[in-house]
Interface confidence: low
């Protein structure tokens, strides 16, 4: 294979937003290979060498009035500006989750099983998934994949409930998400027959 | 206090491959990248282009500066090369799998550097190229990279799939397998 040595330069300009654009932190960061060499932090107000490799750049950029002024103004001219441009399709983006409930394996009643609540295709990632048994919230025996980013501006998550289903029990997966005003709920009823469609 | 949102303008330039990237990231999702060869802005979701514009020429200028800066830093570091970090690979589906219901296989390649990777989808051991798509290299907080590859497919009990990943940090290609699981009862669903 190609075993030549590789050399990587990674600049990153980061805008961190708190409470809308009320508080903004701007970071102008530079990485050689995987190591940060120099950065400007709007909370500091000047360039700082992170490693010795970045010292010449920090000294030079701090000596340049234009560069320093531009970096200090970036919370407004760059961060707040870009937030405003993209707000409607990023910050305000809402996609409702699809919620599906199924047992992980086909088992007769009164056998240990895993009930799966699949929540998929939603945006943003902030979500609350709860399990209820006959109206009472189940807090024990829950296992989750955590939030999975699909890379296409949607998320998914699986929240499993370890249970031994008994006839007549009603299991409910409840999902709260910014795209809906009231929680989404999907019920799964423990029945003796295998098919469980509504 | 944790921030509500983060926007990152992430760039890189890699030698000796002479590959560069310029992209904007919002909370971990790509807003757009600039296609260096075509010199055009590529929106991650087509509708984004209806709300905003980005002048690709500016990114080309940045990449030119990145190239120059990399040369300076390479010299300054006494030609210290990057250490290969191999990827972690996960294959999953976009949504719960139902036989003969269109779905998408996602190959998630994570926590690697440098940003060069060779990814192949295999169906029953043979390469598949129809309908496949991929993201550019996405930044991570630890300054490694992430990447997604997608394969639209029709789930069946006969077909098995692999995502094959090659990276300089791996001794041999890494294959992650996916096949249809034994059927469960029909699911309860809400849209």
């Amino acid at each position: 294979g190609d075993t030549r040595p590789r050399f990587l330069w990674q600049p990153k300009r980061e805008c961190h937003f708190f409470n809308g654009t009320e508080r903004v932190r701007f970071l102008d960061r530079y990485f050689y290979n995987q190591e940060e060499s120099v950065r400007f932090d709007s909370d500091v107000g000047e360039f700082r060498a992170v490693t010795e490799l970045g010292r010449p750049d920090a000294e030079y950029w701090n000596s340049q009035k234009d560069i320093l002024e531009q970096a200090r103004a970036a919370v407004d001219t760059y961060c707040r500006h870009n937030y405003g441009v993209g707000e409607s399709f990023t910050v305000q983006r809402r996609v409702q989750p699809k919620v599906t409930v199924y047992p992980s394996k086909t088992q007769p009643l009164q056998h240990h099983n895993l009930l799966v609540c699949s929540v998929s295709g939603f945006y943003p990632g902030s979500i609350e998934v709860r399990w209820f048994l006959n109206g009472q919230e189940e807090k024990a025996g829950m296992v989750s994949t955590g939030l999975i980013q699909n890379g296409d501006w949607t998320f998914q998550t699986l929240v499993m409930l370890e249970t031994v289903p008994r006839s007549g029990e009603v299991y409910t997966c409840q999902v709260e998400h910014p795209s809906v005003t009231s929680p989404l709920t999907v019920e799964w009823r423990a029945r003796s027959e295998s098919a469980q469609s509504k | 206090i944790k921030e509500e949102h983060v926007i990152i303008q992430a760039e890189f330039y890699l030698n000796p491959d002479q590959s560069g990237e310029f992209m904007f990231d919002f909370d971990g999702d790509e807003i757009f990248h600039v296609d260096m060869a075509k010199k055009e802005t590529v929106w991650r979701l087509e509708e984004f282009g209806r709300f905003a514009s980005f002048e690709a020429q500016g990114a080309l200028a940045n990449i030119a500066v990145d190239k120059a800066n990399l040369e300076i830093m390479t010299k300054r570091s006494n030609y210290t090369p990057i250490t290969n970090v191999p990827p972690e690979v996960t294959v999953l589906t976009n949504s719960p799998v139902e036989l003969r219901e269109p779905n998408v296989l996602i190959c998630f390649i994570d926590k690697f550097t440098p940003p060069v990777v060779n990814v192949t989808w295999l169906r029953n051991g043979k390469p598949v190229t129809t309908g496949v798509s991929e993201t550019v290299f996405l930044p991570r907080e630890d300054h490694l990279f992430r990447k997604f590859h997608y394969l639209p497919f029709l789930p069946s009990t006969e077909d098995v799939y692999d995502c094959r990943v090659e990276h300089w940090g791996l001794d041999e290609p890494l294959l992650k397998h996916w096949e249809f699981d034994a059927p469960s009862p029909l699911p309860e669903t809400t849209e």
Partner: antibody, heavy 120, light 109 residues
């Protein structure tokens, strides 16, 4: 005060190698950010940047001439040397050395220049 | 190789104001500072303006510099006969220093 002075042959033959020395005082080339560059000016023509060496020994060259140029420094002697190979009559020019006080800064002090004629 | 574009010549009468333009691109002027040098006949260039608009000590305030986007300009007010000289702009293109082609300023009269 800062001073720079160029020295080298006034006449070189085509295909020969030109070696110019810039001797400076009033500053140190080991000070972070400082660089010394070479600029030339053919008679009646514009200034053309040739090369620059930084305090940390990074070297930069004009794209069109980089295969012919070599810049080096001797910090203890306060000297910067420029060599230019394969000289041609079109390289006839006044050659200046100048100080850059900061990384990618302006040339704030210049030498008086030395006229180099390339002729057989 | 001349990368920055300047007019070959400008002229003005004593007391007048003249401007000299310097046009570049995003990779040079667009991303970097601009300097201006004055070269009197038979002498070495002298730094006139640095960092777009800063004057070294000893340079009269009749000289001023500005930059907008990928262009820069030098303005001279209250033109005097001793201002007759060649003027050069300079910036950086990636890791290279680049100069303009120079502008000959003639003071009329």
């Amino acid at each position: 005060q800062v001073q720079l002075k160029e020295s080298g042959p006034a006449l070189v033959k085509p295909t020969q190698t030109l070696t110019l020395t810039c001797t400076f005082s009033g500053f140190s080339l080991s000070t972070s950010g400082v660089g010394v560059g070479w600029i030339r000016q053919p008679p009646g023509k514009a200034l053309e940047w040739l090369a620059l060496i930084d305090w940390d020994d990074d070297k930069y060259y004009s794209t069109s001439l980089k295969t012919r140029l070599t810049i080096s420094k001797d910090t203890s002697k306060n000297q910067v040397v420029l060599t230019m190979t394969n000289m041609d009559p079109v390289d006839t020019a006044t050659y200046y050395c100048a100080r850059s006080p900061r990384y990618r800064g302006a040339f704030d002090y210049w030498g008086q220049g030395t006229l180099v004629t390339v002729s057989s | 190789d001349i990368v920055l574009t300047q007019p070959p010549s400008v002229s003005g009468a004593p007391g007048q104001r003249v401007t000299i333009s310097c046009s570049g691109s995003e990779s040079n002027i667009g991303n970097n500072y601009v300097q201006w040098y004055q070269q009197l006949p038979g002498t070495a260039p002298k730094l006139l303006i640095y960092d777009n608009n800063q004057r070294p000590s000893g340079v009269p305030d009749r000289f001023s510099g500005s930059k907008s986007g990928t262009s820069a300009s030098l303005a001279i007010t209250g033109l005097q006969s001793e201002d007759e000289a060649d003027y050069y702009c300079q910036s950086y293109d990636l890791i290279r220093h680049v100069f303009g082609g120079g502008t000959k300023l003639t003071v009329l009269g």
